[in-house]
């Protein structure tokens, strides 16, 4: 499966939208920094078959969609930017789902690495727990926004490696 060039562009647009979403100066939020334990090894892409890598990327984007679709998120971010954000995430999910369907029967290995999917879910559970503990404060959301931008940048590296693997 070829991940379309539009997918990379959508990823870049997603990062640009997230960069615009800030509502307060992050400089006031230094003390709220937190170690969410980003599962770097799941995005290194070395130990994966292609289909498994795609499923991990899909899970990350799905979890991001879920995180920013909550009532608390809607109350925090600009509605217009959120709508653009959802559109880009939806586009990426569709691209990855189409790719996963094409990979069916291509590889002998399972389409999904369950352990990796669970690792990504636990990462997002830690983010949600942090937001809850911080009572969804503006600074907590700023820290989460920075973390998601970083994770998207790192996942973009995996996507590029997948593109080069064709």
């Amino acid at each position: 499966c070829d991940l379309p060039q539009t997918h990379s562009l959508s990823n870049r647009r997603t990062l640009m939208i997230m960069a615009q979403m800030g509502r307060i100066s992050p400089f006031s939020c230094l003390k709220d920094r937190h170690d969410f334990g980003f599962p770097q090894e799941e995005f290194d892409g070395n130990q994966f078959q292609k289909a498994q890598a795609i499923s991990v990327l899909h899970e990350m984007i799905q979890q991001t969609f879920n995180l920013f679709s909550t009532k608390d998120s809607s109350a925090t971010w600009d509605e217009t930017l959120l709508d653009k954000f959802y559109t880009e995430l939806y586009q990426q999910l569709n691209d990855l789902e189409a790719c996963m369907m094409q990979e069916v029967g291509v590889e002998d290995t399972p389409l999904m690495n369950v352990d990796s999917i669970l690792t990504v879910r636990k990462y997002f559970q830690r983010i949600t727990l942090y937001l809850t503990e911080k009572k969804y404060s503006p600074c907590a959301w700023e820290v989460v926004r920075a973390e998601i931008m970083r994770s998207f940048s790192l996942s973009a590296n995996l996507q590029e490696r997948l593109r080069r693997k064709e």
Epitope: L30, R33, A146
Partner: antibody
């Protein structure tokens, strides 16, 4: 390879203006903040201020607020430190360093080589 | 502003010695503390971040500990290249502040 390359040494007279630069390469320039640190001859390190190159938001140490201006041009991955009117007491080595912002990552993990500014009549 | 106080301001030691430098913050900073090494004419170099995490590429003889207000940088076995000035820096809040430095000299 991550690098921060600063502009060369400067010799200026009191009252003159100056703008020194710090060019980042080998990483996404807008994903990190750039901080500036002063070191006067034979003295310790003093944090001056910081900029987020993605939107040019700045924060200054109260000691340097109004004394210097920090700016950035993300199109050329460069941050700047400038003075409108130098004083002899501005004589120092100035370093830029990158900061991970709100991410849980090492602070000031890469530094420029330093720019020596000498102000003398 | 958060004040950072290092001790001692200088010390003399021999190669192979165990060296300990302390840093005290004027208020609790959790584990938001970094340690840097600076050699004459060179830019500072990050050694330890978040109080105890060893920066990539830094020898394991360097270690950091502490949290709250009291922190320690330890060099388990001093090497010739370790003679330098060491600075702590609080990373909790702006303005970021450094300790005054500890110069490690050859005995």
């Amino acid at each position: 390879e991550v690098q921060l390359v600063q502009s060369g040494a400067e010799v200026k007279k009191p009252g003159e203006s100056l703008k020194i630069s710090c060019k980042g390469s080998g990483y996404s320039f807008t994903s990190y903040w750039i901080g500036w640190v002063r070191q006067m001859p034979g003295k310790g390190l003093e944090w001056m201020g910081i900029i987020d190159p993605s939107d040019s938001d700045t924060a200054y140490s109260p000691s340097f607020q109004g004394q210097v201006t920090i700016s950035a041009d993300k199109s050329i991955s460069t941050a700047y430190l400038q003075w409108s009117s130098l004083k002899a007491s501005d004589t120092a080595m100035y370093y830029c360093a990158r900061h991970p912002g709100l991410n849980w990552a090492p602070d000031f993990d890469y530094w420029g080589q330093g720019t020596l500014v000498t102000v003398s009549s | 502003d958060i004040q950072m106080t290092q001790s001692p301001s200088s010390l003399s030691a021999s190669v192979g010695d165990r060296v300990t430098i302390t840093c005290r913050a004027s208020q609790s900073i959790g584990d938001f503390l970094n340690w840097y090494q600076q050699k004459p004419g060179k830019a500072p170099k990050l050694l330890i971040y978040f109080a105890s995490s060893l920066q990539s590429g830094v020898p394991s003889r360097f270690s950091g500990s502490g949290s709250g207000t009291d922190f320690t940088l330890t060099i388990s076995s001093l090497q010739p290249e370790d003679f330098a000035t060491y600075y702590c820096q609080q990373a909790l809040d702006f303005p970021l502040t450094f300790g005054q430095g500890t110069k490690v000299e050859i005995k």
